[in-house]
């Protein structure tokens, strides 16, 4: 039985040209996290495998940085980065948990700075 829950940063905003940390946290389960995939819509951004380390998709390697932890840092943000992001946790023995984050990249300094994991 899957008892865990994914906590995410929810809806966040950031300024064009800036950086943002995407962060998910799996709680309420003792399951072992074996791999976390980060996806933007249907496009793979990165994989963090407990044994093999990080795989950053070559298309994003110049502006995606691994971490902190199982999170992902997006750099040099553009308006095109606006959209849904998913963290997909592969766990043993529970199976797969998915979390969703919505990122809005804003043109000017109207971006909110209250997001819990946002880089100032």
């Amino acid at each position: 039985m899957m008892t865990g829950t994914i906590e995410t940063t929810g809806n966040i905003s950031a300024e064009k040209g800036g950086s943002i940390i995407l962060q998910c946290h799996l709680s309420s389960t003792t399951a072992q996290v074996t791999q976390v995939n980060w996806e933007q819509q249907d496009q793979l951004l990165a994989i963090c495998n407990a044994d093999l380390g990080w795989h950053i998709s070559p298309s994003f390697k110049d502006r995606v940085a691994p971490g902190p932890g199982l999170g992902l840092t997006l750099q040099s943000l553009t308006v095109n980065d606006t959209g849904e992001y998913f963290c997909i946790y592969h766990t043993y023995p529970d199976g797969t948990y998915t979390g969703r984050i919505f990122l809005e990249v804003l043109e000017s300094s109207v971006a909110e700075h209250g997001a819990r994991f946002q880089i100032p």
């Epitope: 074996t34 791999q35 793979l44 994989i47 495998n49 407990a50 044994d51 093999l52 380390g53 990080w54 795989h55 998709s57 070559p58 298309s59 390697k61 110049d62 592969h90 043993y92 797969t96």
Partner: antibody, heavy 119, light 107 residues
Framework: QVQLQQPGTELVKPGASVKLSCRAS????????MHWVKQRPGRGLEWIGR????????KYNEKFKSKATLTVDKLSSTAYMQLSSLTSEDSAVYYC????????????WGQGTTLTVSS | DIQMTQSPASLSASVGETVTITCRVS??????LAWYQQKQGKSPQLLVY???TLAEGVPSRFSGSGSGTQFSLKINSLQPEDFGNYYC?????????FGAGTKLDLK
């Protein structure tokens, strides 16, 4: 087009070390991780490890941790694997292989270097 | 380590036939499985990754399926260039491991 160029053969003596090379071309070398795989006749394929050419960070199969050392030279877009304390068990074909776009599989392989350890 | 059991070990078939190679895995690897073809004296070539996604340039007569612990590679209407060795590999944990291979030869 993507190419991974490896020397065809290497002949070395038992107890010595050897540094195998893999020169990459046709793509941005630092954007793709590189894997190394060992193949012996009748023994199938064995994964040795992978390296991030951008950071130099590597991960090894526990079995090869004390045998293989992976490095890169970004300027020449070349990946290297040094094998130490060679024995006849190390005689094999060694392949470098580029990691794919979507995970830890390998999408392009070099032609392989046949390593012979013999006195 | 994750164990990969490939079957059959060898297979004889004729041009135009359809064949299926299977790979059984010792634990759940979701869909993180690749298939490679290797011809005598050559390096392996990627056919399929993520269990069912065909690699660039691979003919559509090849298809991969399965998830969890059971996977298969199907080749429809065998062509002369399809004969050789086939390997499955999981791409999910350390160490990455390969099946022992299936030798496909001409009947």
């Amino acid at each position: 087009q993507v190419q991974l160029q490896q020397p065809g053969t290497e002949l070395v003596k038992p107890g010595a070390s050897v540094k195998l090379s893999c020169r990459a071309s046709g793509y941005t070398f630092t954007n793709y991780y590189m894997h190394w795989v060992k193949q012996r006749p009748g023994r199938g394929l064995e994964w040795i490890g992978r390296i991030d050419p951008d950071s130099g960070g590597s991960k090894y199969n526990e079995k090869f941790k004390s045998k293989a050392t992976l490095t890169v030279d970004k300027l020449s877009s070349t990946a290297y694997m040094q094998l130490s304390s060679l024995t006849s068990e190390d005689s094999a074909v060694y392949y470098c292989a580029r990691e794919g776009h979507y995970g830890f599989y390998s999408d392009y392989w070099g032609q392989g270097t046949t390593l012979t350890v013999s006195s | 380590d994750i164990q990969m059991t490939q079957s059959p070990a060898s297979l004889s078939a004729s041009v135009g036939e359809t064949v299926t190679i299977t790979c059984r895995v010792s634990e759940n690897i979701y869909s993180y499985l690749a298939w490679y073809q290797q011809k005598q004296g050559k390096s392996p070539q990627l056919l399929v990754y993520n269990a069912k996604t065909l690699a660039e340039g691979v003919p559509s007569r090849f298809s991969g399926s399965g998830s969890g612990t059971q996977f298969s590679l199907k080749i429809n209407s065998l062509q002369p260039e399809d004969f050789g060795n086939y390997y499955c590999q999981h791409h999910y944990g350390n160490p990455l491991t390969f099946g022992a291979g299936t030798k496909l030869d001409l009947k």
